[in-house]
Interface confidence: low
């Protein structure tokens, strides 16, 4: 389905509003430090050019690829070398190398200030004064901080952002209406960004076979009534969509995502009974709804898997004829029967099954060799079950903040070389698994917990790749996607680590502590906890708990004092000395 002008084709398919939004997202994800106004100017220039191509597809340059057009536009930025350094060298390359070069320079942890939320009246005035600019600013600010955010989904977030302001800026109590909605969008947005980052890492680091295996397992759980051929078609289409978005081809990605939603809604009967309410919604909402749809009910009469995958004498013949198809069918059959398993566990089982067939199909008596293959699955299944059980018990015993602290200590002891901000961020997010998953019924706990942990650990891997400091982290991150979480779980105290020298400055606090939000206070305390463990990796839980209780009491006391700064100056050194003594 070739078009004389790719840019005209996408403009017509997507419409001007979505076209402009997606180009802004693409440019903001590539040039993360550029000012907003610069990006708006570039987007307007590209849009005007696209309109000339819609009017005449034979016009000059309209036949160029989108990468060529967008890359040429990005390379017109005057301050490219001063702002981005070696990224400017990308502009000397030809496509497709130039786009690959831009992709490699995407920064998962850009040095950008945290977004500060203005007063509600200020936001409402800005929204009313210029709604279009207000919404573009939202797309720009999110995209530059999250360079792999799933672009068509970001348009959906922007639509919800707009709806929140449209409703709440007219409400009697604007803040009560708006702030919870903005909090929800922020939290959902961070989760969406992290989930997409794992998809892109899966594709970029482990290839489309790894992504397709993930998609087969997940879609088979969601659509257990669908035939294998139907699931395979959805997997192929979904892989194309995510490959495009992860590769910066946002217009193609959004267009193909819309086509996939259309296909699913036209073929509900052969996919799932749960799609109906999604399919009545407008495009952005529909695509989001389909992506989040709950698992359909399992067919009642599914036969045992053993007949086809263990007992049959044709297992090796079927495997040899088409290995990936046979393994894909195994994964499909196993996953549709087990919505209670995490996707990562299902992939481990498929890997174990593949390894057994590789070994046994070359043996003298293959059937005898693979007859007990399902028994070998038991420890693989029990490991995440036990992990979830133990950690949910710990979460229920400690509550979220102290559970996060337990994880901070655990992970700092495992990989003390990792930077303190990274350990705090990752451990805080690991700790959120408790509130997210432990309240769920037993059958939903493992898929919730382990697949969430995979997303959080991917963040650790992505940040660590930018600044590698630990061979153990590199090993867990690169050896096997599906075994990342078990690999990190298995790490013990790093005996080779040389403890960090004590630095009193790290434990010096001031009266500004008292004006911090509860979350910011927690982060400060957790930062100190990580530094303590780096200084004394063999400290016991009791010792660390004691120092942290002492710290909380010290901060509480000084924040209640009349002269707070004097209190911190006087009590701080005492706290440091007492802590050192306690950990000696």
């Amino acid at each position: 389905d070739t078009h004389k002008s790719e840019v005209a084709h996408r403009f017509k398919d997507l419409g001007e509003e979505h076209f402009k939004g997606l180009v802004l997202v693409a440019f903001s994800q590539y040039l993360q430090q550029c000012p907003f106004e610069e990006h708006v100017k570039l987007v307007n220039e590209v849009t005007e050019f696209a309109k000339t191509c819609v009017a005449d597809e034979s016009a000059e340059n309209c036949d160029k690829s989108l990468h060529t057009l967008f890359g040429d536009k990005l390379c017109t930025v005057a301050t490219l070398r001063e702002t981005y350094g070696e990224m400017a060298d990308c502009c000397a390359k030809q496509e497709p190398e130039r786009n690959e070069c831009f992709l490699q320079h995407k920064d998962d942890n850009p040095n950008l200030p945290p977004l500060v939320r203005p007063e509600v009246d200020v936001m409402c005035t800005a929204f009313h004064d210029n709604e279009a600019t207000f919404l573009k600013k939202y797309l720009y600010e999110v995209a530059r901080r999250h360079p792999y955010f799933y672009a068509p989904e970001l348009l959906f977030f922007a639509a919800r952002y707009k709806a929140a302001f449209a409703e709440c800026c007219q409400a009697a109590d604007k803040a009560a209406c708006l702030l919870p909605k903005l909090d929800e969008l922020r939290d959902e947005g961070k989760a969406s960004s992290a989930k997409q980052r794992l998809k892109c890492a899966s594709l970029q680091k482990f290839g489309d076979r790894a992504f397709k295996a993930w998609a087969v397992a997940r879609l088979s759980q969601k659509f257990p009534k669908a035939e294998f051929a139907e699931v395979s078609k959805l997997v192929t289409d979904l892989t194309k969509v995510h490959t495009e978005c992860c590769h910066g081809d946002l217009l193609e990605c959004a267009d193909d995502r819309a086509d996939l939603a259309k296909y699913m809604c036209e073929n509900q009967d052969s996919i799932s009974s749960k799609l109906k309410e999604c399919c009545d919604k407008p495009l952005l909402e529909k695509s989001h709804c389909l992506a989040e749809v709950e698992n359909d009910e399992m067919p009642a009469d599914l036969p045992s898997l053993a007949a086809d995958y263990v007992e049959s004498k044709d297992v090796c013949k079927n495997y040899a004829e088409a290995k990936d198809v046979f393994l894909g069918m195994f994964l499909y059959e196993y996953a549709r029967r087990h919505p209670d398993y995490s996707v990562m566990l299902l992939l481990r089982l498929a890997k174990a099954y593949e390894a057994t067939l590789e070994k046994c199909c070359a043996a003298a008596d293959p059937h005898e060799c693979y007859a007990k293959v399902f028994d070998e699955f038991q420890p693989l299944v029990e490991e995440p079950q036990n992990l979830v059980k133990q950690n949910c018990e710990l979460f229920e015993q400690l509550g979220e903040y102290k559970f996060q602290n337990a994880l901070l200590v655990r992970y700092t002891k495992k990989v003390p070389q990792v930077s303190t901000p990274t350990l705090v961020e990752v451990s805080r997010n690991l700790g959120k698994v408790g509130a997210k998953c432990c309240k769920l019924p037993e059958a939903k706990r493992m898929p919730c917990a382990e697949d969430y942990l995979s997303v959080v650990l991917n963040r650790l891997c992505v940040l660590h790749e930018k600044t590698p400091v630990s061979e153990k982290v590199t090993k867990c991150c690169t050896e096997s996607l599906v075994n990342r979480r078990p690999c990190f779980s298995a790490l013990e105290l790093d005996e080779a680590y040389v403890p960090k020298a004590f630095n009193a400055e790290t434990f010096t606090f001031h009266a500004d502590m008292c004006t911090l939000s509860e979350k910011e206070k927690q982060v400060k305390k957790q930062t100190a906890l990580v530094e303590l463990v780096k200084h004394k990796p063999k400290a016991t839980k009791e010792q660390l708990k004691g120092v942290m209780d002492n710290f909380a009491a010290f901060v509480e006391k000084c924040c209640k004092a009349d002269d707070k700064e004097a209190c911190f100056a006087e009590e701080g050194p005492k706290f440091v000395a007492a802590s050192q003594a306690a950990l000696a």
Epitope: V547, A553, K557, A578, A581
Partner: nanobody, 115 residues
């Protein structure tokens, strides 16, 4: 090691007063901080009051102005004077002590506020 033994708990009417004591023995020369905590049935243990060797004190808002912590170093005893008691003060009250934080705990004494 430090041993702590609480006493003074009992039944009291709302608005009434009670004085708890905690006798410390063992390696008490290392004790810098002493505190009272309480735990109501089915609830988390809650901090009530703390006093340092130098005599500085702190309290949560829930008891401030009603409860007073004090210690007699010569008798190795910690006290908690509780006035204007309320039904929600019903709990087992624990004495705790330690050199840097409260790492030694007593067995607790029950306080019931009820009419």
């Amino acid at each position: 090691q430090v041993q702590l033994v609480e006493s003074g708990g009992g039944l009291v009417q709302p608005g009434g007063s009670l004085r708890l004591s905690c006798a410390a023995s063992g390696s008490i020369e290392s004790i810098n901080r002493m505190a009272w905590y309480r735990q109501a049935p089915g609830q988390q243990r809650e901090f009530v009051a703390r006093i340092s060797k130098g005599g500085s004190t702190n309290y949560p808002d829930s008891v401030k102005g009603r409860f007073t912590i004090s210690r007699d170093n010569s008798k190795n005893t910690l006290y908690l004077q509780m006035n204007s008691l309320r039904a929600e003060d019903t709990a087992v009250y624990y004495c705790a002590a330690g050199p840097v934080w409260e790492q030694f705990w007593g067995q607790g004494t029950l306080v019931t506020v009820s009419s």
